[in-house]
Interface confidence: low
Amino acid sequence: RRRRRDTHFPICIFCCGCCHRSKCGMCCKT
């Protein structure tokens, strides 16, 4: 059986304050 494709793949960008308020770095969001 084919598994349903997960459309909630992560998008990762270098960002400051996006994932954590004092961190600059790669931040991944689904």
């Epitope: 400051c16 304050g17 994932c19 954590h20 308020r21 004092s22 961190k23 600059c24 770095g25």
Partner: antibody
């Protein structure tokens, strides 16, 4: 080496304002946030607030937010904390500290300034 | 606001003994957001432990941290003379708060 150097001690009268500076060196200033912490004589540590050096976002302790302003000057890698309408119970040592992150978790206030004593007295 | 309660307020022990310091949170704290500091008289605090159990750079292995949820512990396995100072726990949630501190004194 990584360090935070604060401005000198201050004596102020009640009702006045004080502005303490915190100059960073040895790391990329805009990649980290700065928290300010104070300690009244013989007392514990009180967190005052935070500023993101990269975007100027702030988060202030509820009991101080009406009187405190935190800013940064990225051209000189310096953070500032201004406290207005000073009272005698604002007499304390004021510290700036770098807020560290390691992967996905908070890695503590990992670098501290030497402290600035602010005395409020008439 | 998360309130951190440290106990005991003062701990009286002898050099070489084991010290157990407790930090209890008023609500659950992610282990990733719990840190411990040491403060010597007249000095700025120094980071000891972050992420509840990770030692900061240069911290001797006699210091260790553990815990999760609302209960966290700092253990000093063998007290050295320079360890008889004040220790604070601190959490980072929506904002940052410190515990009231534990003073470790010589018995």
């Amino acid at each position: 080496q990584v360090q935070l150097v604060q401005s000198g001690d201050e004596v102020k009268k009640p009702g006045a304002s004080v502005k303490v500076s915190c100059k960073a060196s040895g790391y990329t200033f805009i990649k980290y946030g700065i928290s300010w912490v104070r300690q009244a004589p013989g007392q514990g540590l009180e967190w005052m607030g935070w500023i993101g050096a990269f975007n100027g976002n702030t988060d202030y302790a509820r009991n101080l937010q009406a009187r405190v302003t935190m800013t940064t000057d990225t051209s000189t890698s310096t953070a500032y904390m201004e406290l207005r309408s000073l009272r005698s119970d604002d007499t304390a040592v004021y510290y700036c500290a770098r807020e560290g992150w390691n992967d996905d978790y908070f890695s503590g206030l990992d670098v501290w300034g030497q402290g600035t004593t602010v005395t409020v007295s008439s | 606001e998360i309130v951190l309660t440290q106990s005991p307020g003062t701990l009286s022990l002898s050099p070489g003994e084991r010290a157990t310091l407790s930090c209890r949170a008023s609500q659950s704290v992610s282990s990733n957001y719990l840190a411990w500091y040491q403060q010597k008289p007249g000095q700025a605090p120094r980071l000891l432990i972050y992420g509840a159990s990770s030692r900061a750079t240069g911290i001797p292995d006699r210091f260790s941290g553990s815990g999760s949820g609302t209960d966290f512990t700092l253990i000093i396995s063998r007290l050295e003379p320079e360890d008889f100072v004040v220790y604070y726990c601190q959490q980072y949630g929506s904002s940052l708060t410190f515990g009231g501190g534990t003073k470790v004194e010589i018995k």
